[in-house]
């Protein structure tokens, strides 16, 4: 039995998979900030988690996926305000009783030290200093990501 949050996550991921392939992204679009091989977009407004997920999808991106603690720290360094929380692409899967990224993978317990409960309708937010479990209905800011395409020894003609 999937929760409404899980279903929303799956639906959006499937619709993203159905879209036609686009050429790789070599530079971050305007308003997006580059962090290593990603482009990040920090929202100005607030939304519950599923609306944030949908907003990123409309921008041909996804809610932020964090690979490891190092990436978390670098992302947090871009947050200038201690008091602001941002949704990322991680929520609690009731059916699997585990934290699940929106790409379908499960959280490695060593990656993030989450403050708060792991329970139904819980989603993960990050601040400048910490990682929190919040009710998914809470309205906070969010972070979208786009992956940059690595360029390996390719020679491009002058455009």
């Amino acid at each position: 039995q999937k929760s409404s949050i899980e279903k929303c996550s799956v639906d959006i991921q499937q619709s993203r998979n159905k879209t036609t392939e686009r050429p790789g992204l070599l530079n971050c679009p305007i308003y997006w900030q580059q962090l290593r091989e990603k482009c990040l977009l920090f929202s100005h407004t607030v939304n519950p988690w599923n609306n944030s997920l949908a907003d990123c999808s409309t921008k041909e991106s996804s809610l932020l996926l964090i690979r490891d603690k190092d990436e978390l720290i670098h992302t947090q360094n871009l947050i200038r305000d201690k008091a602001i929380l941002f949704w990322i692409g991680l929520n609690f899967s009731l059916s699997e009783k585990n934290w699940k990224w929106i790409n379908g993978s499960f959280l490695n317990s060593n990656d993030l030290e989450i403050r708060g409960d792991a329970k139904e309708n819980s989603c993960i937010s990050i601040s400048q200093t910490s990682v929190y479990s919040e009710y998914c209905s809470t309205e906070i800011r969010w972070i979208c990501q786009k992956e940059l395409t690595p360029v390996r020894n390719k020679v491009y003609p002058d455009s």
Epitope: Y31, T45, I79, R80
Partner: antibody
């Protein structure tokens, strides 16, 4: 309603640095991207660059080597510095705000300040 | 960079007439990130339309925008005396942000 007010010298000598400040009132400096736009007398509009409250900036490549935009969140101000100016930099300089991908276009503008480059 | 070409350069019309202003982009404007502004002498530009077709707050419904990709249009259904001004289009989907050269709508 957000209000923007430009301030700075109206006359700058060639080869010197043009410095302007935009003061933001009635709005959160954390909720917008803050741009400088200029308009030479009788001509069109040219975007110079923007800054986000985090300090992340984006500049027009045509001016990038000469431009610095900075933000002071505690004073709710952002500033423009344009180095090595010439007569071609004579223009009305506007500060403006936009919400990036969540808004659309520059919804708030300062009244503009004319900067003349002359010896 | 995306170059925006506005036409005509000048439009001479009478109050009550319909004005149709064109803005053509050198490449596709992503997500219809296109805005229109009105500027009167000695004043800052005023946002009219964003997202190609959405009216900004407080803008009368005689102003409408349409188009996508590379071709965009601003229509003023019935010109009022206060509408005679210069109109600029602007794209905000790619860096650098760019403006069109403007269309002057003058009284015939």
């Amino acid at each position: 309603q957000v209000q923007l007010l430009e301030s700075g010298p109206g006359l700058v000598k060639p080869s010197e640095t043009l410095s302007l400040t935009c003061t933001v009132s009635n709005g959160s400096i954390r909720s917008y991207y803050w741009s400088w736009i200029r308009q030479p007398p009788g001509k069109g509009l040219e975007w110079i660059g923007y800054i986000y409250y985090s300090g992340s900036a984006n500049y027009n490549p045509s001016l990038k080597s000469r431009v610095t935009i900075s933000v002071d969140t505690s004073e709710t101000q952002f500033s423009l510095k344009l180095s090595s100016v010439t007569a071609a930099d004579t223009a009305v300089y506007y500060c403006a705000s936009d919400r990036g991908p969540w808004g659309g276009g520059f919804d708030y503008w300062g009244q503009g300040t004319l900067v003349t480059v002359s010896s | 960079e995306i170059v925006l070409t506005q036409s005509p350069g000048t439009l001479s019309l009478s109050p009550g007439e319909r004005a149709t202003l064109s803005c053509r982009a050198s490449q596709s404007v992503s997500s219809s990130y296109l805005a229109w502004y009105q500027q009167k002498p000695g004043q800052a530009p005023r946002l009219l339309i964003y997202g190609a077709s959405s009216r900004a707050t407080g803008i009368p419904d005689r102003f409408s925008g349409s188009g996508s990709g590379t071709d965009f249009t601003l229509t003023i259904s019935r010109l009022e005396p206060e509408d005679f001004a210069v109109y600029y289009c602007q794209q905000y989907g790619n860096s650098p942000l760019t403006f069109g050269g403007g269309t002057k709508v003058e009284i015939k």
